[in-house]
């Protein structure tokens, strides 16, 4: 069964900067990745970025840079311009559309006890959907 993993990392040097890493574990080719926060895409979540392997990358503030890391994983850098970061208690969700498997989504957040610079371990898959 395909799986999606999510890691949320606070940058050690900038406490207002976070990076979300997401990956797809499974066969098939990825046709689209959607990253959202506050919940799954289309279910109360707000889009942060859309990464298409051919068309490029579209991102919404406070996303700063979305990039493919490998053929099946992406990273999204976020920067909070406010005094205190809202990211620490936020859920981030990644949805991978792949052919021929369909869509798979998982969510994760920064553990409350995380030290800056340390990433959360790969999140168990609390929301795993095949559309």
């Amino acid at each position: 069964t395909p799986e999606v993993w999510v890691q949320v990392q606070m940058e050690a040097t900038e406490l207002s900067s976070f990076t979300v890493h997401c990956g797809f574990l499974g066969p098939g080719s990825i046709s689209l990745v959607t990253v959202s926060w506050g919940g799954p895409d289309g279910a109360g979540g707000t889009k942060l970025a859309v990464l298409h392997p051919e068309l490029g990358t579209r991102q919404w503030a406070p996303a700063r840079q979305a990039r493919w890391e490998t053929q099946s994983s992406i990273s999204l850098a976020l920067e909070d311009s406010g005094a205190s970061s809202p990211f620490a208690n936020t859920t981030f969700c990644c949805k991978f559309a792949s052919f021929p498997e369909g869509s798979w989504e998982s969510c994760g957040s920064l553990p409350p006890s995380s030290d800056p610079g340390l990433s959360a371990p790969p999140t168990p898959v609390p929301i795993l959907r095949a559309d």
Epitope: H52, P53, E54, L55, G56, Q59, W68, Q71
Partner: antibody, heavy 120, light 113 residues
Framework: QVQLVQSGAEVKKPGASVKVSCKAS????????MHWVRQAPGQGLEWIGE????????NYNEQFRNRVTMTVDTSTSTVYMELSSLRSEDTAVYYC?????????????WGQGTLVTVSS | DIVMTQSPDSLAVSLGERATINCKSS????????????LAWYQQKPGQPPKLLVY???TRESGVPDRFSGSGSGTDFTLTISSLQAEDVAVYFC?????????FGGGTKLEIK
């Protein structure tokens, strides 16, 4: 053929708002995001934002986020860009442009431009 | 935001000669997934909107004469006009179409010597 026809020139006072329209024809209107780009006199090009005509989803440049509103009227295949709290630095030609089918941010068809002059 | 820097600011070339315009980006525009560089070139004549010439660094837009060619990868790109024609007098802009917000170079004014 693809055509983007914009509304006419505007003269506005500082602090006022302006709403520019862009009517599209010659292609499947809901299938392409529409972008707005401006060019101050003798200057370069600056991206303002984009709107998805199929659902009204917008994406704005941070520099304009608090002052710009983009809307769409699918019944007339028209998109609108409203810029508020105008200042003299907003004097520019404003263009609507359609994204290229092969990539999100290359712009393959442009309107003729709308000159917005902000002057007291 | 990705910063685009063009050079030179202006260029005078004789008719029939080669014109070369350079563009540098503050970060790589190479998409590791499809190995394409997300860099576009536009031509703008006085009183007209910009016209897309090249995208993905080297793909010519349909209808664009083959004397226009784009090259480069990563952060360094070039637009070449192999044999300058009178109608090529214009301002040329590069633009990254890699990610939001798309950003443009400052422009290069091309004139006839």
């Amino acid at each position: 053929q693809v055509q983007l026809v914009q509304s006419g020139a505007e003269v506005k006072k500082p602090g006022a708002s302006v709403k520019v329209s862009c009517k599209a024809s010659g292609y499947s209107f809901p299938s392409y995001w529409m972008h707005w780009v401006r060019q101050a006199p003798g200057q370069g090009l600056e991206w303002i934002g984009e709107i998805n005509p199929s659902n009204g989803l917008t994406n704005y440049n941070e520099q304009f986020r608090n002052r710009v509103t983009m809307t769409v009227d699918t019944s007339t295949s028209t998109v609108y860009m409203e810029l508020s709290s105008l200042r003299s630095e907003d004097t520019a030609v404003y263009y609507c442009a359609r994204h290229h089918g092969s990539t999100y941010y290359a712009l393959d068809s442009w309107g003729q431009g709308t000159l917005v002059t902000v002057s007291s | 935001d990705i910063v685009m820097t063009q050079s030179p600011d202006s260029l005078a070339v004789s008719l029939g000669e080669r014109a070369t315009i350079n563009c540098k980006s503050s970060q790589s525009l190479l998409n590791s997934i499809n190995q394409k560089n997300f860099l576009a070139w536009y031509q703008q004549k006085p009183g007209q909107p910009p016209k897309l010439l090249v995208y993905f660094a080297s793909t010519r837009e349909s209808g664009v004469p083959d004397r226009f060619s784009g090259s480069g990868s990563g952060t360094d790109f070039t637009l070449t006009i192999s044999s300058l024609q009178a109608e090529d007098v214009a301002v040329y802009f590069c633009q990254q179409h890699y990610s939001t917000p798309p950003t443009f170079g400052g422009g290069t004014k091309l004139e006839i010597k």
